[in-house]
């Protein structure tokens, strides 16, 4: 069980001095700084017992394994359920304390009731201040039962719960109808998942026989020992004023554990410390009684005396719980109550014994949980004891459980059970996670979920280039920190794996699954230069650039052109995917917009330095296209064009532009201005005879508008080769705009 104790200080005359402390004896408990050690939590649980809101309680952390709750201002702040949560992962455990008001109408005869599955539980609420109304019993805050107030027996209201099952566990309360919840008697019922003396999934395993009021845990078969006792079977008493699984904690204050309630993980519940009893744990045990709540009787034999903290203190020559065993009987000495080994290791286990006659090697044996008996391979004989050493065969998971060292001589026999925990070395279930990458380094998070057992003592990261047969490189890292793999090759895939270890020999787990992490390309360093640009329409821009000449191959995959429209706060990005390109046509731009333009070289996902920016103003958009364009040959060198003005003009037309192109020709088209915008016809002269031409035209206001439909027409006859087409409107010659 998790070594977690919730202490309640019951100085009830002054709520402001009341405090709750949660103490963990777990390794690394409460650090909370990483995934390996969640913090201790201590809080009031208002889900079932709701009390009037008061000022917030103060939580103080004292070191890594202790947390204290203070700040109670009035007695009602104390009433209810408090819980402490500690331990990591599957061992996360909640310890619960239920506090009753000493001034309540009804008081519990006993707050914590631990019973076995199938037992009958009886909760008894003693009348402290009588009311002549019904008594309502609740379970976990919900209605459970009603009693008439006349049903009190000897001043007590009883709730009988026959054949209880684990779901019956919880907080029970007895309240007079109409009384404040603070006047209720609160109880905690813990129902073990098995019948008496059994544990395990099917309740098939036998409990070790917990002593001194220890309770057998129904999941793991361990004894949860009362405060003040230790050992696999709670056979050993701590020194007065000490508690914790190894007696490592000390009660605060000069009066030791007086006035403290101790709550331990289920199925133990809560009790006074060893040597104390009463509702406020302030009464010493009566003569002949000892232990938590003074529940145990000494019954010492052979002149033993009763100590209220530890039980029988035996005179010289005797030992045993009741001083019933003579020292002539052999005795196992200083056997650890619990040992931990890693799977598939072959540990050595020592067992020491004394007695008269003196034990020899053959008289000491070791028994495994499956009944196999191991004989010692060697023994060390000293004046006061014999220590037998056992070489254990390769451990398997089934070896977990209670082992027994047994000594037999003609003077009698003794045995000591101890728990062996076979732990599975941790194996990562997932690959490590790539956080960031550069061309020569990878930053990796080694924290991954794992199968097997913690705690994690070391994390190893193994890595090598993908498809390589070279040895793996290894780095040992702190479990809680990210790792930087350095001095790597650019643009290279690396196979990376995690290996976890737990404490002890053979604690290294198998390597986790590999993951491929690729270093980035080298950053492109060349800065392009914008050579020029020209507007090819209201929404089209042709840009050209250059790169400085440097020796060696070009480091780059292409170019990124960026256009920033400051007015609208919009950025346009154009990818040019050839590193050889030095020009690009940008289309679909917004007419009449002022753009800031730059260009960058890119390589993989990395961008090089941007060119100095250029500022470009696109002309506004022009008018709609002229309508019904028609071409009519007049001679072997002249074609007349006629059209209708565009509709819905935004303003007066400044000119028309005619585009002339030889049908099927490969040359650039010619553009001819018509400067009299009121005209609806023009004659194009200087054309070649018997030649097919294509014509289209557009209007201009502030900017050029949309093109009209394209028309075809051929010149007549066989004339001379003309110098080139010109335009005449109403016999007036106009210049040529190419």
């Amino acid at each position: 069980a998790v070594d977690l104790t919730l202490l309640a200080n019951l100085r009830l005359t002054d709520p402001q001095r009341f405090f709750l402390t949660c103490v963990s004896g777990e390794a690394g408990a409460g650090r909370g700084s990483d995934a390996w050690g969640p913090p201790l939590l201590l809080e009031k649980d208002d889900r079932i017992v709701r009390t009037p809101p008061g000022p917030p309680l103060r939580l103080a952390r004292n070191g890594s394994h202790q947390v204290t709750l203070r700040g109670f201002s009035k007695p009602s702040d104390l009433v209810g359920v408090f819980s402490c949560v500690g331990g990591a992962g599957a061992r996360r455990t909640r310890v619960i304390y239920v506090h009753n008001s000493p001034g309540a109408h009804l008081l519990p005869d006993k707050v914590t009731h631990t019973v076995n599955k199938g037992d009958t539980a009886v909760l008894s609420a003693r009348v402290h201040k009588e009311k002549q109304t019904d008594v309502i019993w609740k379970s976990n805050g919900s209605y459970f039962y009603t009693l008439d107030w006349h049903e009190a027996q000897d001043g007590r209201f009883l709730l009988q719960l026959p054949n209880v099952q684990p779901p019956s566990s919880g907080i029970y309360s007895a309240t007079y109808l109409e009384a404040s919840p603070l006047g209720s008697a609160f109880f905690r019922l813990i129902v073990r998942g098995c019948g008496a003396g059994r544990w395990g999934p099917g309740c098939t395993k036998e409990c070790p026989g917990c002593l001194h009021g220890g309770v057998c845990h129904d999941h793991d078969g361990e004894c949860v020992c009362p405060p003040g006792f230790t050992g696999t079977r709670c056979e050993q008493a701590c020194r007065e004023g000490r508690f914790g699984q190894s007696c490592q904690e000390q009660c605060p204050g000069i009066s030791g554990c007086r006035g403290l309630t101790f709550c331990l993980p289920d199925p133990y519940g809560c009790s006074c410390g060893s040597g104390w009893r009463g509702s406020q744990c302030q009464e010493a045990c009566a003569p002949g009684h000892f232990g938590a709540d003074c529940r145990l009787q000494c019954q010492c034999q052979n002149g033993g005396t009763c100590d209220r903290f530890s039980g029988c203190v035996c005179p010289s020559g005797w030992h045993g719980v009741h001083c019933e065993k003579s020292d002539r009987i052999p005795q196992i000495l200083n056997m650890a109550s619990e040992l931990e080994f890693n799977l598939e290791t072959m540990p050595r286990i020592n067992c020491a014994a004394a007695g008269n006659p003196f034990p020899v090697r053959g008289s000491i044996e070791l028994r495994k949980p499956d009944g196999t008996v191991l004989l010692s391979t060697k023994a060390i004989v000293e004046p006061e004891k014999t220590t037998a050493e056992f070489e254990v065969p390769r451990l398997v998971l089934a070896d977990s459980g209670f082992w027994e060292c047994r000594v037999s001589t003609s003077g009698g026999q003794d045995s000591r059970r101890f728990k062996v925990n076979v732990k599975v070395p941790p194996v990562p279930l997932a690959a490590p996670r790539l956080l960031t990458k550069q061309s020569r380094q990878l930053v990796v998070s080694p924290l991954v979920s794992f199968s097997g057992d913690g705690p994690i003592s070391t994390v190893r990261l193994h890595y090598r280039p993908q498809d390589s047969t070279m040895d793996w490189s290894t780095i040992v890292v702190d479990p809680s920190e990210n790792v930087t793999l350095m001095n790597l090759r650019p643009k290279t895939g690396y196979s990376v794996r995690v290996q976890l270890s737990r404490p002890g020999e053979g604690g290294e787990g198998a390597w986790g699954p590999p993951t491929l992490m690729t270093t980035d390309c080298p950053e492109p360093l060349l800065q392009p230069w914008l050579e020029g640009w020209h507007v090819e329409g209201t929404d089209r821009l042709r840009v050209s650039w250059s790169l400085p000449l440097v020796p060696g191959p070009l480091v780059g995959d292409g170019f990124l052109l960026r256009l920033w429209d400051g007015t609208r706060g919009q950025e346009r990005r154009e990818n040019v995917s050839s590193p050889q390109a030095r020009t690009a046509l940008l289309t679909g731009l917004t007419p009449g917009t002022h753009y800031q333009l730059d260009v960058q070289l890119y390589h993989c996902t990395l961008l090089g330095p941007a060119s100095p920016p250029a500022h470009v103003l696109l002309p506004p958009s022009g008018p709609p296209a002229p309508r019904h364009l028609h071409a009519q040959a007049l001679s072997d060198s002249e074609i007349q064009l006629t059209w209708k003005h565009p509709e819905a003009l935004p303003g007066p037309i400044s000119k028309y532009v005619v585009e002339v192109q030889v049908a099927g020709g490969a040359g650039d088209p010619l553009w001819i201005d018509v400067d009299r915008p009121e005209e609806t016809s023009t004659i194009i002269r200087g054309l070649n005879a018997s030649t097919r031409y294509l014509f289209r035209m557009r209007a201009s206001i502030q900017g050029l508008g949309d093109w009209s439909n394209t028309v075809e027409e051929s010149t007549l006859g066989n004339g001379l080769q003309a110098e080139g087409p010109v335009q005449e409107s109403r016999a007036a010659e106009e210049g040529l705009d190419q």
């Epitope: 002549q132 019904d134 209605y143 009603t146 009693l147 006349h150 049903e151 109808l177 109409e178």
Partner: antibody
Framework: EVQLLESGGGLVQPGGSLRLSCAAS????????MDWVRQAPGKGLEWVSS????????YYADSVKGRFTISRDNSKNTLYLQMNSLRAEDTAVYYC??????????WGQGTLVTVSS | QSELTQPASVSGSPGQSITISCTGT?????????VSWYQQHPGKAPKLMIY???NRPSGVSNRFSGSKSGNTASLTISGLQAEDEADYYC????????????FGGGTKLTVL
């Protein structure tokens, strides 16, 4: 779903007897206090009798005390009302109701008792 | 056995709010926060509408609300609807050990 179903009503002569039953389902009958409430034609509700979960404690309205007996069989999830020495003024629809913390939270549909010669 | 005092009838138009009072003594309404209100349509069983003075069971419209002052409890129905037309009864826990509970005489609510 909580359900209460009364039965046993009918026509009876003055001085006669009748036993009403109330079959309960959808909840743990043995944990709840139960009541009988009646309503004479065109009149209001009148509490008749109560019984506690254990069956050991019972209470009656003055108008029926000594003539009516409330009982329960927790193993059969059934509530009873034994009515003796019936009078014309006992004519009413009799309802059984579940009581939870001084509130009759579920009611049956009622059974009509007519006392007439 | 004294019953709690309720008005014999109240009425209101759709959309309006109405309040029904229930007056007792310090031994019942005034002494305990266990006042309940029940709705009964003709020929039907009573239905719990409010318990413990002001709590609504699940499924009961939030147009129904309860309160208490001294020895008098009140049921308020806001946004009156045609289906609210029914008899309404109050009841209270009582300190008399011979009584399981005490009812009001009932109030007929008419929706005009």
């Amino acid at each position: 779903e909580v359900q209460l179903l009364e039965s046993g009503g009918g026509l009876v002569q003055p001085g006669g007897s009748l036993r009403l039953s109330c079959a309960a389902s959808g909840f743990t009958f043995s944990k709840y206090k139960m009541d009988w409430v009646r309503q004479a034609p065109g009149k209001g509700l009148e509490w008749v009798s109560s019984i506690y979960p254990s069956g050991g404690f019972t209470y009656y309205a003055d108008s029926v005390k000594g003539r009516f007996t409330i009982s329960r069989d927790n193993s059969k999830n059934t509530l009873y009302l034994q009515m003796n020495s019936l009078r014309a003024e006992d004519t009413a629809v009799y309802y059984c109701a579940r009581e939870k913390m001084a509130t009759m939270d579920y009611w049956g549909q009622g059974t009509l008792v007519t006392v007439s010669s | 056995q004294s019953e709690l005092t309720q008005p014999a009838s109240v009425s209101g138009s759709p959309g309006q709010s109405i309040t029904i009072s229930c007056t007792g003594t310090s031994s019942d309404v005034g002494g305990y926060n266990y006042v309940s209100w029940y709705q009964q349509h003709p020929g039907k069983a009573p239905k719990l509408m409010i318990y413990e003075v002001s709590n609504r069971p699940s499924g009961v419209s939030n147009r129904f609300s309860g309160s208490k002052s001294g020895n008098t409890a009140s049921l308020t129905i806001s946004g009156l609807q045609a289906e609210d037309e029914a008899d309404y009864y109050c009841s209270s826990y009582t300190s008399s050990s011979t009584l399981g509970g005490v009812f009001g005489g009932g109030t007929k609510l008419t929706v005009l």
